[in-house]
């Protein structure tokens, strides 16, 4: 191990230097260590499983964005191995506070049974 | 240029022993993780050997786990399967195939050497 | 092991049709599902790795789909050149394991 080395970088024995990780292509994340200094000899990348995607690099794949089940939101584009589900307008019986801050989430929509009286997607 | 080529088959009695190569050429055979697959006579493939590119990790499948070994020669370009306690059921081609590199699974095949077993 | 089935065995079609080869693991292998096509010299080539991937130099004419457990390879328009048997194999546990294969005749 060579603690000169960066957290994606490994010792190449034969030229002696640090030398960067092999990244992963989009849809897939590392498999076996490489870091450090070290780099495992069947360090590799694996496909993202389904219901996660990476942009690749050295991220792991993470699961994709639970627009109904989380948001309560249509959705809008379905994520693949590539890339997260993009979330649409609400479910039925739901509405989106406009004027509330994104939190870590972004939107989030809310059940019409709280919103203000008059609410343009509740009415009806 | 043929990139992977076997040699070694032949017949072979049960029992005896027999040690297969695969000559690797046009590309770099350290960088690579290397496998040894074989097809019994109207049979599907099977996966029997697996040797990293710098042999720190070895696997081999049940069927011939303890009887076979994979080894390789990283200087002389060259994949090795030495077969002892040969038996009828390892009547078949045998394929050398590379592990492409970080990924998990067979990219390139050699044309097969085939072993038969018998008295 | 992980069982890889390819219920058809051998299949029948024309030129120019689409054709659907299926596979299935006897649990998720999390795309780690591989395409392999070997001709009746004994040829053998990779065609789709994880899924949906095409292999380099190979025809957009294949394609794969599926995840879990259910996998499939579609040739969308049958060339003669297409009749070989094709395995599919699961990298996901070890031992790396492969369906029986299909084989693809011209009718």
């Known amino acids: 191990e060579d603690s000169n080395c960066g957290e994606n970088e490994y010792h190449n024995q034969t030229t002696g230097l640090c030398q960067q990780c092999p990244p992963c292509r989009p849809g897939e994340e590392p498999y076996m260590s490489c870091g450090y200094g070290t780099k495992d000899d069947d360090y590799g990348c694996v496909p993202c499983p389904a219901e996660k995607f990476s942009k690749g690099g050295y991220q792991i794949c993470r699961r994709h964005k639970d627009c109904e089940g989380f948001f309560r939101a249509t959705v809008l584009t379905p994520g693949d191995m590539e890339n997260d589900a993009e979330c649409g307008p609400c479910l039925p019986g739901y509405y989106m506070l406009e004027n509330r801050p994104r939190n870590i989430y972004g939107m989030v929509c809310y059940s019409c049974l709280l919103a203000p009286p008059n609410t343009k997607e509740c009415v009806g | 240029e043929v990139p992977l080529e076997e040699s070694g088959g032949g017949l072979v009695k049960p029992g005896g022993s027999r040690k297969l190569s695969c000559a690797a050429s046009?590309?770099?055979?350290?960088?690579?993780?290397m496998h040894w697959v074989r097809q019994a006579p109207e049979k599907g493939l099977e996966w029997i050997a697996y040797?990293?590119?710098?042999?720190?990790?070895?696997y081999y499948s049940d069927t011939v786990k303890g009887r076979f070994t994979i080894s390789r020669d990283n200087a002389k370009n060259t994949l090795f399967l030495q077969m002892t306690s040969l038996r009828s059921e390892d009547t078949a081609m045998y394929y050398c195939?590379?592990?492409?590199?970080?990924?998990?699974?067979?990219?390139?095949w050699g044309a097969g050497t085939t072993v038969t077993v018998s008295s | 092991d992980i069982q890889m089935t390819q219920t058809t065995s051998s299949l029948s079609a024309s030129l120019g049709d689409r054709v659907t080869i299926s596979c299935r693991a006897s649990?998720?292998?999390?795309?780690?599902l591989n395409w392999y096509q070997q001709k009746p010299d004994g040829t053998v080539k990779l065609l789709i790795y994880?899924?949906?991937r095409i292999h380099s130099g190979v025809p957009s004419r294949f394609s794969g789909s599926g995840s879990g457990t259910d996998y499939s390879l579609t040739i969308s328009n049958l060339e003669q050149e297409d009749i070989a048997t094709y395995f599919c194999?699961?990298?996901?546990?070890?031992?790396?394991?492969f369906g029986g294969g299909t084989k693809l005749e011209i009718k």
């Open positions: 649990q998720d292998i999390g795309n780690h």
């Open positions: 994880y899924t949906s």
């Open positions: 046009g590309f770099t055979f350290s960088d690579h993780g």
């Open positions: 040797i990293s590119s710098g042999s720190s990790n070895v």
């Open positions: 195939a590379r592990r492409e590199l970080l990924r998990f699974y067979f990219d390139v």
């Open positions: 194999q699961q990298g996901n546990t070890l031992p790396w394991t």
